[in-house]
């Protein structure tokens, strides 16, 4: 603590520095809290959260999902394969998070925070990964045309797309969190 500390403004006591695993865990929970805040606005604004017509919109989307072969589930768990899947999936979600940026009126700042904190999470995970060569980065041209296509949808489909992105991202992060806690 620097000199000149006054008694009413005492710094927190020293604690053990955060480990990589702890910090990644906290970062995922940070993003999940952000998703909850965004979902609250989405569900209040429209009835998408109760809709049964999700399949109609889902056809337009290719949202990352965890599968058995990814090595992230308890059966057939493979640390390296799973970490590659988590990073690749997050990179694939980035275009969808970009789409979300203009979809919120009262939660504009939260949408930006979710996008930026995901970029930070990717950085943290890339430091942890040994096999960075196995991580495929999405093609920027493909992403740009996907973004244009999503933004050209009618209002109902855009609302549904927003809801599906948030739901899928939440599920992906929850699976990632469980898997990372085993590493």
């Amino acid at each position: 603590v620097p000199p000149g500390e006054d008694s009413k403004d005492v710094a927190a006591p020293h604690r053990q520095p955060l480990t990589s695993s702890e910090r990644i865990d906290k970062q995922i929970r940070y993003i999940l809290d952000g998703i909850s805040a965004l979902r609250k606005e989405t569900c209040n604004k429209s009835n998408m959260c109760e809709s049964s017509k999700e399949a109609l919109a889902e056809n337009n989307l290719n949202l990352p999902k965890m599968a058995e072969k990814d090595g992230c589930f308890q059966s057939g768990f493979n640390e390296e394969t799973c970490l590659v899947k988590i990073i690749t999936g997050l990179l694939e979600f980035e275009v969808y998070l970009e789409y979300l940026q203009n979809r919120f009126e009262s939660s504009e700042e939260q949408a930006r925070a979710v996008q930026m904190s995901t970029k930070v999470l990717i950085q943290f995970l890339q430091k942890k990964a040994k096999n960075l060569d196995a991580i495929t980065t999405p093609d920027p041209t493909t992403n740009a045309s996907l973004l244009t296509k999503l933004q050209a949808q009618n209002q109902w489909l855009q609302d549904m797309t927003t809801h599906l992105i948030l739901r899928s991202f939440k599920e992906f992060l929850q699976s990632s969190l469980r898997a990372l806690r085993q590493m």
Epitope: V10, A11, A12, P17, L18, S20, K119, V120, Q123
Partner: nanobody
Amino acid sequence: QVQLVESGGGLVQPGGSLGLSCAASGFTLAYYGIGWFRQAPGKEREGVACISSSDLSTYYADSVKGRFTISRDNAKDTVYLQMNSLKPEDTAVYYCAAGTWDLKFGYSRSNCVRSYEYDYWGQGTQVTVLS
């Protein structure tokens, strides 16, 4: 040993610029919210700028807004404070500090200039703007 080290201080003419750096040893700086504080002789320490580790958002005290820029490079594990249009009243010892004030979504950004939010402190670097 866990420590923060500031560098880049010095003597400068009014209107000049200086760039401060903050690096860590013994822990990963990228995992923490970082604040820059300053203390002039006979004055209370004040928070001038901070940057989140969670979403990279920034906050500035009114006294430095538009003149100072805080940034971080997670690959280099370093945080910077670029100070432009310096005034004699910017003369002080500048400290960087690391804390976990930014780990809860919806944290109040302005809280980051409160010293009790920080766990680790550097020894400081002197910045003198000639009057």
